[in-house]
Interface confidence: medium
């Protein structure tokens, strides 16, 4: 059997025998275009493609539509993988989405969606989610049904206001909704009573800004 040299996601990399977490090169589906991503090969059986990470406030997440489309940051630290790649990938087969959260008191929680995909750019990378389980709230902190993606220069929310400008960061804002993992990073002891922080309402409430977040995807049949 010929050895696989290009990979669409971290699950394919894991199955090829590369089982060490780190930065790998992924290839867009049906294309030769490449993108660098961090692969978590340990958590929950491995094979996770990290599509978002916040951990220290080192990267500015108040970015343009184009930046959220192509991705920004550093895969070894804080970054956004890119809406276009994630949209193309999640429309090829069924993916699960796991969102791992840390607060400032040493607690951790997660939300797992059994089916996740993003619509195309023409449909504003609208998020589609089904089947929530996990410890970060029994109700989805990403509004259902899913909303279009909004950025500071691409206002697609359901608010008279501009959620992305008011709350900062690109996200699937409603009006403005119970979450924003791309909000302002507040250091410890500045992380409460902040309306524009890193929010996951059904775990920590509206004014609490989280210490760390990771969004990761993996094929449902992994």
């Amino acid at each position: 059997k010929e050895e696989q040299t290009t990979f669409r996601d971290c699950a394919e990399i894991f199955k090829s025998g590369l089982t060490t977490s780190g930065i790998y090169t992924l290839t867009f589906p049906n294309s030769t275009e490449e993108i660098k991503a961090y692969c978590d090969m340990e958590a929950g059986g491995g094979g996770w493609t990290i599509i978002q990470r916040r951990e220290d406030g080192s990267v500015d997440f108040q970015r343009t539509w184009k930046e959220y489309k192509v991705g920004f940051g550093n895969p070894s630290g804080e970054y956004w993988l890119g809406n276009e790649f994630v949209s193309q990938l999640t429309n090829q087969q069924r993916y699960v989405l796991k969102i791992h959260l840390k607060d400032w008191e040493g607690n951790e929680a997660y939300s797992l969606y059994e089916h996740f995909y993003l619509s195309s750019e023409e449909l504003n990378y609208r998020i589609h989610l089904k089947g929530l389980t996990g410890t970060a709230g029994k109700i989805s902190s990403i509004s259902q049904p899913g909303n279009d993606f909004s950025t500071k220069d691409g206002d697609n929310d359901k608010c008279i206001c501009k959620c992305s400008q008011m709350l900062t960061g690109g996200w699937w804002f409603d009006a403005c909704g119970p979450s924003n993992l791309n909000g302002m990073y507040y250091p410890q002891r500045q992380n409460t009573n902040k309306f524009n922080g890193i929010k996951w309402y059904y775990w920590k409430g509206s004014g609490y800004s989280l210490k760390a977040t990771t969004m990761m995807i993996r094929p449902a049949d992994f």
């Epitope: 507040y186 250091p187 410890q188 002891r189 500045q190």
Partner: antibody, heavy 120, light 106 residues
């Protein structure tokens, strides 16, 4: 009486390194966040770095990230700032400051400062 | 970064008179503002925090007000020991200082 005494400043060439120390007394260091704040000659104040009570959280201003590292030794009641790849713009009086309880970055006691001069 | 702008840069006041110093934040910082006094060759001294709360041992002639983006430090009757440089500082999102206001004898 709360007291903080900085040391370790001096003249250093661009690209060089220095380690600043702050000896604290009159309070229990392990109960407080601590910070370094600097002041360039004739200029205003700039927060540089701070560190949680047990050393598990550290923050640095963007202009010094990757070059400066804050640390502490609670057993010795000491705070440190390791500075490397020094630049002319790092020339300043460096103060160690105690963060007021329950509010990071609000400085209720300061040392008298130590002067760092970066020049060839 | 939140930018703090103080005005005026220099304030000339006679002893016994009132001094009013202003500080503006580039975005809302709620009441997370402090004022410090610094005399030549000395370290800064905390005067006011929470925009209006006097620190321990600070005389009642010092008062602070404001919230959001506009703040004021008032010294009701200037004493000789009050002539110094005053800095405002926000601690709402990271930590930044204003450029200072020098209060000098008129």
């Amino acid at each position: 009486e709360v007291q903080m005494v900085e040391s370790g400043g001096g003249l250093v060439q661009p690209g060089g390194s220095l380690r600043l120390s702050c000896a604290a007394s009159g309070f229990t260091l392990r109960s407080y966040w601590m910070s370094w704040v600097r002041q360039a000659p004739g200029k205003g104040l700039e927060w540089v770095a701070n560190i949680k009570e047990d050393g598990s959280e550290k923050y640095h201003v963007d202009s010094v990230k990757g070059r400066f590292t804050i640390s502490r030794d609670n057993a010795e009641n000491s705070l440190f700032l390791q500075m490397s790849s020094l630049r002319a713009e790092d020339t300043a009086v460096y103060y160690c400051a105690r963060d007021m309880e329950a509010s990071a970055g609000l400085f209720d006691y300061w040392g008298q400062g130590t002067l760092v001069t970066v020049s060839s | 970064e939140i930018v703090m702008t103080q005005s005026p840069a220099t304030l000339s006041v006679s002893p016994g008179e009132r001094a009013i110093l202003s500080c503006r934040a580039s975005q809302s910082i709620s009441s997370n503002l402090a004022w410090y006094q610094q005399k030549p060759g000395q370290a800064p001294r905390l005067l006011i925090y929470g925009a209006s709360t006097r620190a321990t041992g600070i005389p009642a002639r010092f008062s602070g007000s404001g919230s959001g983006t506009e703040f004021t430090l008032t010294i009701s009757s200037l004493q000789s020991e009050d002539f110094a440089v005053y800095y405002c500082q926000q601690y709402n999102y990271w930590w930044t200082f204003g450029q200072g206001t020098k209060v000098e004898i008129k």
